[in-house]
């Protein structure tokens, strides 16, 4: 089959802005440019270094990052958001997304929580101090929005199948995710429906075809009764808490 | 109102170089995906070639059939994708389109298209 | 790559009748819970015009005469009642995997 890219990925993450010219390899359905993941010779292509990868809202960035501006010795251009490590506890944030898994942004501070219950995206009220580097931290702050469309832009929000820049844009239990070359409303994952549990930093945030993160109240696990040889290719699926 | 417009069509010899424009108004330019399909005499629609939006680092694609010899581009401060097209041969002869996907995962807005002759 | 067989290459039809235009993909163009198939119409010396996307949902401005239904392999493209400005050709397009594909298009005429 061509549709040869990482297809079941729950971390909805964007791409380093163009290298270069366009890196096909000989066999390959498409040629994309550059550095995204697919395959050639039936071997996974992708880039062997970490890259920051910008990004307009959480959702785009991994269960263990959150997307705000570089701090000034960062690596990025003036103005991006790209997604950021999350913060430990006792550290300081502005919305639940920059704490790091199991914890929640209260009075400013990460904390620890037995319930992942909270929305990405969503902006601790009590806080009023800026967080230094962080001004833009606030989803979706400074990013362009569609006003120049047709007035079905201004009063709906996408179906399945619709452009989106940001999940905003979406209607409910739907989320904005990459499909190729675009931003697409795709179903927010139900119980039982695979996802998958990046490991590493670095480690995705190439997939071009991407799925949504898992419905409330669900967390991306392993699967106990799945078995496989190799530890890294284990099933993950959405479970209930 | 969105609105495509090419241009840069014509009669090119086997071997040569065109490059199309595609004037674009009406909309965000740079935060929207942007192609080129073509069309050969009385035969259907091909894609030729996609670059991102904004938000996804403008990324391009290719089919294997235009790859290495076309490159698409896009100036955001001018509203205008470009298509540079090399070493034509005669079955590139087409009309050439530019299309956008603005409100739906399709091509949702075309322009009218440019005629590209490759011919000796 | 993804192949797209419209069918029946042409119809001939009278206005007012039903037209069930059909396409079939050579392997699901279903993921994400979404059907990613659109159906355009094209008349002579224009530029084609989305009608549905995601299998069934319908393009700005588009009739309601105008409707696709469809899932997996098999799609069909439906337009109740035809009007003098249907008689066109139509195409139907996969977006599921790369490269996007489109199929030979169906050729609507008046009988």
């Known amino acids: 089959t061509l549709n040869s890219v990482l297809i079941n990925s729950n971390a909805i993450k964007n791409l380093p802005p163009p290298l270069g010219g366009a890196g096909g390899q000989p066999g390959s359905a498409v040629s994309v440019a550059p550095g995204v993941l697919y395959e050639g010779g039936n071997k996974y292509q992708t880039l062997d270094n970490y890259q920051p990868y910008p990004c307009a809202e959480d959702e785009e960035c991994g269960s263990d990052e959150y997307c705000s501006s570089p701090s000034r010795g960062a690596a990025g251009v003036g103005g991006v958001q790209i997604c950021l490590a999350c913060r430990k506890r006792r550290k300081r944030c502005m919305r639940h997304a920059m704490c790091c898994p199991g914890n929640y942004c209260k009075n400013g501070i990460c904390m620890p929580s037995d319930h992942s219950h909270f929305p990405r995206g969503e902006i601790e009220e009590s806080i009023i101090e800026n967080l230094g580097n962080d001004h833009n931290a606030a989803a979706g702050d400074g990013y362009p929005r569609r006003t120049t469309l047709t007035s079905k832009i201004y009063h709906t929000k996408g179906q399945e199948g619709s452009v989106c820049l940001r999940s905003s844009d979406c209607a409910a239990g739907l989320c904005c995710a990459r499909h190729f070359w675009s931003k697409i409303c795709k179903p927010v994952l139900k119980e039982g429906q695979v996802c998958t549990k990046h490991k590493r930093k670095g480690s995705h945030g190439l997939e071009i075809f991407q799925r949504c993160y898992c419905g409330e109240g669900l967390a991306c696990r392993i699967q106990k009764d799945h078995h496989q040889a190799s530890n890294s290719s284990r099933l993950h699926t959405c479970q209930r808490h | 109102e969105v609105q495509l417009v090419e241009s840069g069509g014509g009669l090119v010899q086997p071997g040569g170089s065109l490059r199309l424009s595609c004037a674009a108004s009406g909309f965000t330019f740079s935060s929207y995906a942007i192609s080129w399909v073509r069309q050969a005499p009385g035969k259907g629609l091909e894609w030729v070639a996609s670059?991102?939006?904004?938000?996804?680092?403008?990324?391009?694609y290719y089919p294997d059939s235009v790859k290495g010899r076309f490159t698409i581009s896009r100036d955001n401060a001018k509203n205008s994708l470009y298509l540079q097209m090399n070493s034509l041969r005669a079955e590139d002869t087409a009309v050439y389109y530019c299309a956008t996907s603005l409100e739906n995962y399709a091509f949702d807005y075309w322009g009218q298209g440019t005629t590209v002759t490759v011919s000796s | 790559e993804i192949v797209l067989t419209q069918s029946p290459a042409t119809l001939s039809l009278s206005p007012g009748e039903r037209a069930t235009l059909s396409c079939r993909a050579s392997e699901s163009v279903d993921d994400f819970g979404i059907s990613f198939i659109n159906w355009y119409q094209q008349k002579p010396g224009q530029a084609p015009r989305l009608l549905i996307y995601?299998?069934?949902k319908q393009g700005s401005g588009i009739p309601a005469r105008f409707s696709g239904s469809g899932s997996g392999t098999d799609f069909t493209l439906t337009i109740s009642s035809l009007e003098p400005e249907d008689f066109a050709v139509y195409y139907c397009q996969q977006l599921k995997e790369v490269p996007p594909t489109f199929g030979g298009g169906t050729k609507v005429e008046i009988k």
């Open positions: 995601a299998g069934s």
């Open positions: 670059v991102s939006g904004t938000g996804l680092g403008f990324q391009t």
